[in-house]
C-alpha cells in the first residue's frame, strides 16, 4: 500500500495497528514504557517502522500537542552533527545541548533536547500505515 | 561556553560550618540531564567526591560526610550552594564544582566536563 | 564502596617516552545498563581537573589522540605516547557505575 514512498511521505491509508495513532498519512507509536535509545530502535524496527524522524515544524508542532514534560526518543542523534536516522541534517528547529557526551536526541512538548543515549525514556516510533518497506 | 567559579571563606576555624558557592553560566540547571557535583582535594591527597545536585533537584551526597553535608541550587541565579558543618582541619582542601550528565541513575553520574578553577579552603584555629 | 587502586603512584618518565597507568577496581564496574563508567582525569598543578576518558576508551572534545583508554571489568588502563612537558601531572581514574562515585588515589606523572 505505502510501497515505493520515500522518507517523508506515505500514501493516504485508512488504519494504524493496535495502540498506534493515526495522524495524516503516518501512524505513531507512543511508548509507556521506557527504554534506553539503542533498545527503543530496535523496538521501533521489529514493527517495520522507525524511531521518529520529524520532516519539518508542521509535524513537530502538531506532535507535541501529544506530549507533556516527559521526554521522549526521538530518531535523532549527534555523529559529526545533528542528524535524523535517515541521513538528514536536523536544519528547521534547534536542540537544546551542550554537552560532548549527549548525542542522543529527544523531544518534549517545549522541543528537543540532548541526552545520554542511555537514559531510559518513552519514545516514538513511526511508519506508514501497514507498510512492510517505506519505513521513514 | 560553559563556565564554573567557586567561591568560599578561605579560612575558617574548626566547628564553624563552610559555606560554598558555585556560581555558572552556559548552561541551566533546569535542563535535563545536567548536575553539578562538588569536589575536593586535600594537599597530597586524592581527589574526593562529596555531594551533587540534578536538574529535578534529586540530591546525593558522600555516605561518611553525610550528616555534615548539604547541597541545594537557585536556579535563577545559576548558582549551587554546598555547606559542610563541624569542620576539622582534615576538611583542609581546595575545593572544586563541576557539571556533571545523568545516566539514568540519580545517585551517581559521568563525565565531569567542565570544572571550576577551585577555591582554597584552610580549617585553623 | 569501589576502591580504585592505581599503579604506580609515582611514574618518572624522559620525554618522548610511552606511560601506561593502571587503574584496577575492587568489584566489576559494569553498570546494569551495559556500559562502563571509569573515566580519567589529568590535574597539573595550579589547574582544576580535566576530562580525558570516559566510558574507558572515549577521548573526551580536544583530547589528543596521544591518550587512549583501554580495559573491561576490573582492569582499565591509559596509555600516553610521547610524553611531553605539557602532560605531566597527576592522573586519576573515576568510577561513576556504581554509588558512591570514587576516585583512585592518583598517579603522579613526572620527569626522571
Known amino acids: 500500500l505505502c510501497q515505493g514512498s520515500n522518507y517523508s511521505t506515505c500514501a493516504s491509508c485508512p488504519s494504524c495497528p493496535d495502540r498506534w495513532m493515526k495522524y495524516g498519512n503516518h501512524c505513531y507509536y507512543f511508548s509507556v514504557e521506557e527504554k534506553d535509545w539503542n533498545s527503543s530502535l530496535e523496538f521501533c524496527l521489529a514493527r517495520d517502522s522507525h524511531l521518529l524522524v520529524i520532516t519539518d515544524n508542521q509535524e513537530m508542532s502538531l506532535l507535541q500537542v501529544f506530549l507533556s514534560e516527559a521526554f521522549c526518543w526521538i530518531g535523532l542523534r549527534n555523529n559529526s552533527g545533528w542528524r535524523w536516522e535517515d541521513g538528514s541534517p536536523l536544519n528547521f528547529s534547534r536542540i537544546s545541548s551542550n554537552s560532548f557526551v549527549q548525542t542522543c536526541g529527544a523531544i518534549n512538548k517545549n522541543g528537543l533536547q540532548a541526552s545520554s543515549c542511555e537514559v531510559p525514556l518513552h519514545w516514538v516510533c513511526k511508519k506508514c500505515p501497514f507498510a512492510d518497506q517505506a519505513l521513514f | 561556553q560553559v563556565i564554573l567559579k567557586e567561591s568560599g571563606p578561605g579560612i575558617l576555624q574548626p566547628s564553624q560550618t563552610l559555606s560554598l558557592t558555585c556560581s555558572f553560566s552556559g548552561f541551566s540547571l533546569t535542563t535535563f540531564g545536567m548536575g553539578i557535583g562538588w569536589i575536593r582535594h586535600p594537599s597530597g591527597k586524592a581527589l574526593e567526591w562529596l555531594a551533587h545536585?540534578?536538574?529535578?533537584?534529586?540530591?546525593s551526597y558522600n555516605s561518611a560526610l553525610k550528616s555534615r553535608l548539604t547541597i541545594s541550587k537557585d536556579t535563577s541565579k545559576n548558582q549551587v550552594f554546598l555547606r559542610l558543618a563541624n569542620v576539622a582541619t582534615a576538611d583542609t582542601a581546595t575545593y572544586y564544582c563541576?557539571?556533571?550528565?545523568?545516566?539514568?541513575?540519580?545517585?551517581?553520574?559521568?563525565?565531569?566536563?567542565?570544572w571550576g578553577q577551585g577555591t582554597s579552603v584552610t580549617v585553623s584555629s | 564502596d569501589v576502591l580504585l587502586t592505581q599503579t604506580p603512584l609515582s611514574l618518572p618518565v624522559s620525554l618522548g617516552d610511552q606511560a601506561s597507568i593502571s587503574c584496577r577496581s575492587s568489584q566489576n564496574i559494569v553498570h546494569s545498563n551495559g556500559n562502563t563508567y571509569l573515566e580519567w582525569y589529568l590535574l597539573k598543578p595550579g589547574q582544576s581537573p580535566k576530562l580525558l576518558i570516559f566510558?574507558?576508551?572515549n577521548r573526551f572534545s580536544g583530547v589528543p589522540d596521544k591518550f587512549s583508554g583501554s580495559g573491561s571489568g576490573t582492569d582499565f588502563t591509559l596509555k600516553i605516547r610521547r610524553v611531553e612537558a605539557e602532560d605531566l601531572g597527576i592522573y586519576y581514574c573515576f568510577q561513576g557505575s556504581h554509588v558512591p562515585p570514587t576516585f583512585g588515589a592518583g598517579t603522579k606523572l613526572e620527569l626522571k
Open positions: 566510558k574507558v576508551s
Open positions: 563541576a557539571r556533571t550528565i545523568y545516566y539514568g541513575n540519580y545517585l551517581t553520574f559521568y563525565a565531569m566536563e567542565h
Open positions: 545536585i540534578w536538574w529535578n533537584d534529586d540530591k
